[in-house]
Amino acid sequence: YSHWPSCCPSKGQDTSEELLRWSTVPVPPLEPARPNRHPESCRASEDGPLNSRAISPWRYELDRDLNRLPQDLYHARCLCPHCVSLQTGSHMDPRGNSELLYHNQTVFYRRPCHGEKGTHKGYCLERRLYRVSLACVCVRPRVMG
Amino acid sequence: YSHWPSCCPSKGQDTSEELLRWSTVPVPPLEPARPNRHPESCRASEDGPLNSRAISPWRYELDRDLNRLPQDLYHARCLCPHCVSLQTGSHMDPRGNSELLYHNQTVFYRRPCHGEKGTHKGYCLERRLYRVSLACVCVRPRVMG
C-alpha cells in the first residue's frame, strides 16, 4: 500500500463509530453473499440465483463476528463433488470437479488501544486479511505430471 | 451493524496509518485475486490456477485507487460467452453460459475531515460498498416462464 498523509480525526470525532454509521450505499442488491432459499441439492436449477443455477452449485454459510468489519461474511460450501451435467442439470459428470474459490479479504478488527504506561484508551481498528471462500467453480482436474 | 463502543485513538496514534501499516498477515498465499500468467484464451487448462482450469475461465483486471482501502482490487472478466466442454477443454458447450459472479465488497475511502467552521482537519475513512466481479461461473441458462 502507498503511504497516505496523516489522518487525524478532529476533536470529538470517533473514527470507528464513523465507519460503522455509514449506511447509505448506492449499490443495487446483488444475488450472492446472501443465503439462497432454493432447495440445497446437487443439481443445477434453471432459475433462481447464480449459486443454484451453477453446474458447481453452492450454498452460503454465515460467519458473524461483532468485533470485525464487515461483521457478516459468507463462505461458499459446494453441494457436489463433481460438476453437474449441462444436458440435464441433475446428474453428475465426473470429468469435472467442483472446487472452492478462495480470496483473502481485507477486514478490520476492533482491538483495545493502549496509551502511555499501557493504560486502556478505547478501541483501535486493526487491518487483517481474512480467507473466505467465494464460490464453487467447475474445473478440469489437474493433470499430474 | 451492531453498535461498537467508542474508539478514540490515544494521543499520537493515527488510525488510518495504523490500518495501513498492518502488513504481517498469517494467511497462506492463494491463487485468486492475482492476475494469472497463463495465456488468456477460451479454454480450460489442466494445470495452473483455478481461473484458468475453470470451464468458465476468466482473467483478472486490476482496479487501483490510492484513496481507497484496499487500494488494489481485481475484477474478473470472462474469457468465453459459454462454458468450455469438459470432454476437450477447448470447444464451447452452448448449453451452459459463463456468467460473472458479483459481490458488494466493503471498502474504505480517504476523505478530508472538516473541523469546526469547516476547517480542514486531516483525513477520515468513509465506509462504502463497492461492486466487484469475483469469478465466472458456468450456469444453465435461465428458463423464461
Epitope: L86, Q87, T88, G89, S90, R95 | Q87, H91, M92
Partner: antibody
C-alpha cells in the same frame, strides 16, 4: 433381451393420482436412464421425464409440479406418479430405456408396449 | 424449451420410391466438442410403441434396414427412406436429447401412393 412392461389402473378419476409401474426383465435396471413418455389419443409423443442413476430426475416443466419418477432396484421397477389428474392426462403411457453415453443421456432404444390410462369420473 | 418442427405433416410415396422427411429444431443441437448432433428418429406403426431408427442424427440403430438414413447438422435434419416398402407405412418422429426437457416433433405420416 431386455423387456419393459407397463402396468397400472386403466381408469383414474379426476383429481386423483395416476400410479404406473414399469417392470424391467432380462436386463439390469442399473447403469441406464429410464424415461416416461405419453401419447394422447390420435396425437404425438410427449416426454414426461426421466431418472438417471436411480436418483437424478428431470421432468417436463409443464408437468413438474405433479409428477414423480422413482426406481426400486430390488424389484427392477420404475414408477411414475402423476397427481391431480384431469381428462387432459388421458393417454397411452410408455416406459423406455435410454442409452447412456459419455456421462450423457442418449436416445430411447427400448420401449414397453404402453398402457392406456383414461381419466374419467 | 427446444421446439421441434417437422414437414411435411404427411406424404404419400410410391413403393420403391424415395421418401424424405425434414425436422428443424428451434436451436442448435450440435455439440462441437464431440461433433455429435443430439437428435434421434423414431418410427411408430399403428397400435405399436415407437421404435428407434436413428440416433446422433445419422447413426443407424442395430437391426434397422439400410434404406433408412439420417443426415443434417445443427438445426436442420432429414430422414430418408431410399426405397419405400409396404412395412414402412408409419408415423415418424424426430426428438432432441440435447438438453432437458427432451422434446419430440409433431410427427410425419408416411403412406403408400
Amino acid at each position: 433381451q431386455v423387456q419393459l412392461q407397463e402396468s397400472g389402473p386403466g381408469l383414474v378419476k379426476p383429481s386423483e393420482t395416476l400410479s404406473l409401474t414399469c417392470t424391467v426383465s432380462g436386463g439390469s435396471i442399473n447403469s441406464y436412464s429410464w424415461t416416461w413418455i405419453r401419447q394422447p389419443p390420435g396425437k404425438g409423443l410427449e416426454w414426461i421425464g426421466n431418472i438417471y442413476n436411480s436418483e437424478n430426475t428431470n421432468y417436463n416443466p409443464s408437468l413438474k409440479s405433479r409428477v414423480t419418477i422413482s426406481v426400486d432396484t430390488s424389484k427392477s421397477q420404475v414408477s411414475l406418479k402423476l397427481n391431480s389428474v384431469t381428462a387432459a392426462d388421458t393417454a397411452v403411457y410408455y416406459c423406455a430405456r435410454t442409452y447412456n453415453w459419455n456421462y450423457e443421456i442418449g436416445a430411447m432404444g427400448v420401449w414397453g408396449q404402453g398402457t392406456t390410462v383414461t381419466v374419467s369420473s | 424449451d427446444i421446439v421441434m418442427t417437422q414437414f411435411p405433416d404427411s406424404l404419400a410415396v410410391s413403393l420403391g420410391e424415395r421418401a424424405t422427411i425434414n425436422c428443424k429444431s428451434s436451436q442448435n443441437v450440435l455439440i462441437t466438442s464431440n461433433n455429435k448432433n443430439y437428435l434421434a428418429w423414431y418410427q411408430q406403426k399403428p397400435g405399436q410403441p415407437p421404435k428407434l431408427l436413428i440416433y446422433w442424427a445419422s447413426t443407424r440403430e442395430f437391426g434397422v434396414p439400410a434404406r433408412f438414413s439420417g443426415s443434417g447438422s445443427g438445426t436442420d435434419f432429414t430422414l430418408t427412406i431410399s426405397s419405400l416398402q409396404a412395412e414402412d407405412v408409419a408415423v415418424y418422429y424426430c426428438q432432441q436429447y440435447y438438453s432437458t426437457p427432451f422434446t419430440f416433433g409433431p410427427g410425419t405420416k408416411v403412406d403408400i401412393k
